[in-house]
């Protein structure tokens, strides 16, 4: 069964800067990745970035740098300032569209006890099927 993992890290040097890493554990070919915050995309979440392997990358503030790390994982750096700044309990979600598995999404946030510079362990749950 395919899985999506999400890792959230607060940068020690900039306390309002977050790095989100997401990956897809499956055998299919990824056709689109959507990163959102505040909940799953389409369910109250706000899109931060969309990554298409053959067309490119689109991002919206406060996203600063979205990129592919591997064929099946991405990373996104958020730079917060003012009203658009993420906070420690913000939920980030990654949705992978893959053929033939369909769409798979997982969400994660920084653990309340995390110190700056530490990261949440990759969490494959919860996984939502959204074909």
């Amino acid at each position: 069964t395919p899985e999506v993992w999400v890792q959230v890290r607060m940068e020690a040097t900039e306390l309002s800067s977050f790095t989100i890493r997401c990956g897809f554990l499956g055998s299919g070919s990824i056709s689109l990745v959507t990163v959102s915050w505040g909940g799953p995309n389409g369910a109250g979440g706000t899109t931060l970035a969309v990554l298409h392997p053959e067309r490119g990358i689109r991002q919206w503030a406060p996203a600063r740098q979205a990129r592919w790390e591997t064929q099946s994982s991405i990373s996104l750096i958020l730079e917060g300032s003012g009203a658009s700044s993420p906070c420690a309990n913000t939920t980030f979600c990654c949705k992978f569209a893959s053929f033939p598995e369909g769409s798979w999404e997982a969400c994660g946030s920084l653990p309340p006890s995390s110190d700056p510079g530490l990261s949440a362990p990759p969490t494959p749950a919860p996984i939502l099927r959204a074909d």
Epitope: P53, R55, W68
Partner: nanobody
Framework: EVQLVESGGGLVQPGGSLRLSCAAS????????MGWYRQAPGKDRELVAT???????KYVDSVKGRFTISRGDAKNSVYLQMNSLRAEDTAVYYC????????????WGQGTMVTVSS
């Protein structure tokens, strides 16, 4: 399918300058890497310079200090300012785009000829 259209090639004397331009048809997504390659007669195609959408730049050693790559205000446009041109810079220059930066899908322009000769 992303289309790349180059312009700016031509005949120039040694020591002269040219500015190459490349515009991509993709206007919604940012192309992660755009760059320039060249192919001289009888030689393999070689990297000249690349630039990511975050501004990371690479040059081949032979053009460092003479060529400058940049991305324009217009989405997914890339430029190559070529100064102090030499005869060995004569080649067909190709615009290149790698939307993901992983090489999964790479696009090429049709090429523009640069001839450096007196």
């Amino acid at each position: 399918e992303v289309q790349l259209v180059e312009s700016g090639g031509g005949l120039v004397q040694p020591g002269g300058s040219l500015r190459l331009s490349c515009a991509a048809s993709e206007t919604y997504f940012d192309l992660y890497v755009m760059g320039w390659y060249r192919q001289a007669p009888g030689k393999d195609r070689e990297l000249v310079a690349t630039i990511t959408y975050t501004g990371s730049i690479k040059y081949v050693d032979s053009v460092k200090g003479r060529f400058t790559i940049s991305r324009g205000d217009a989405k997914n446009s890339v430029y190559l300012q070529m100064n102090s041109l030499r005869a060995e810079d004569t080649a067909v220059y190709y615009c290149n785009a790698d939307p993901s930066g992983l090489g999964r899908k790479v696009y090429w322009g049709q090429g523009t000829m640069v001839t450096v000769s007196s």
